[in-house]
């Protein structure tokens, strides 16, 4: 899978709609373990004025809470600013708006810097097709296979989707 390493040709609007989280990776394993701050799941996305709006599902007390977040555009085309558990530089690494999206975040929380990557797909039945691309991006940015968590249906708040 050859990614274009930039925002989709037709613009961010092509990213709008439903998405499913498939895999997470981090250089700090606690962040993506159950109840980790970045063990969150995409529900849907929309784009407006160059900014990305996402509804994410956060497991809490056996339930899943839907939270809306906005990643604000920057002067760099594939980079966004996101405030979530500190400050995040959010990058779109590989984008095929009809199929899959790989993003990674460099998170700054107090004096701690962390790296988190996220694979999401349009169609969960095709998730296996895009795991190699995710592994490749992770390897490229310095995350190894043993730092990747592939999510199961139980993990990703499937019951909370309307």
């Amino acid at each position: 899978q050859e990614g274009n390493h930039e925002e989709p040709q037709g613009g961010l609007e092509e990213l709008s709609g439903r998405w499913h989280s498939v895999a997470l990776a981090s250089n700090k394993s606690d962040l993506i373990k159950p109840w980790g701050h970045f063990r969150v799941f995409i529900h849907s996305m929309s784009a407006k004025d160059g900014n990305l709006h996402g509804d994410i599902l956060i497991p809490q007390d056996g339930q899943c809470e839907k939270v809306s977040l906005t990643a604000f555009k920057t002067a760099t085309s594939n980079k966004f600013d996101l405030e979530y558990w500190g400050h995040n530089d959010l990058y779109l690494a590989e984008v095929d708006p009809k199929s899959y999206l790989i993003l990674y975040m460099i998170n700054q929380y107090n004096d701690d810097t962390s790296l988190v990557a996220h694979l999401m797909v349009r169609d969960l039945s095709r998730q296996q097709d895009f795991l190699p691309a995710f592994e490749s991006v992770c390897e490229d940015i310095g995350l190894h296979k043993d730092q990747i968590v592939v999510l199961s249906d139980d993990d990703r708040c499937q019951g909370s989707r309307d």
Epitope: H5, N27, A93, T113, S114, D140, I141, G142, L143
Partner: nanobody, 121 residues
Framework: AVQLVDSGGGLVQAGDSLRLSCVAS????????MGWFRQAPGKERLIVAT????????HYADSVEGRFTISRDNAKNTVYLQMNSLEPEDTAVYYC??????????????WGQGTQVTVSS
């Protein structure tokens, strides 16, 4: 062990440009994420920019974003730092080193000799 040779520094005026180079020995260069750091007099060594193994993904410190560009040529075992619109605050010794990932966490203590950049106002 990885050996690194930094070059390209100099004395320039504010607003000028410089291009730093760092050549790494060894055949495993392309298996490392690389980073440029800088250390101003009396200050700690801070990350400036990082670049992924393939060279397609990068990350910059806020203070240099939009002015500096990191790139690499894996065939030449070289990483570059193009520095534009230089400011007196950019004065420091610049070092490149392999890092664990794009956040710039260092891998051991591999440092070159550094290259001095001095920006006068």
């Amino acid at each position: 062990a990885v050996q690194l040779v930094d070059s390209g520094g100099g004395l320039v005026q504010a607003g000028d440009s410089l291009r730093l180079s760092c050549v790494a020995s060894g055949r495993t260069f392309s298996s490392y994420v690389m980073g440029w750091f800088r250390q101003a007099p009396g200050k700690e060594r801070l990350i400036v920019a990082t670049i992924s193994k393939s060279g397609s993904l990068t990350h910059y410190a806020d203070s240099v974003e939009g002015r500096f560009t990191i790139s690499r040529d894996n065939a030449k075992n070289t990483v570059y730092l193009q520095m534009n619109s230089l400011e007196p605050e950019d004065t420091a010794v610049y070092y490149c080193t392999p890092v664990s990932d794009l956040t710039g966490r260092r891998l051991g203590s591999y440092w070159g000799q550094g290259t001095q950049v001095t920006v006068s106002s």
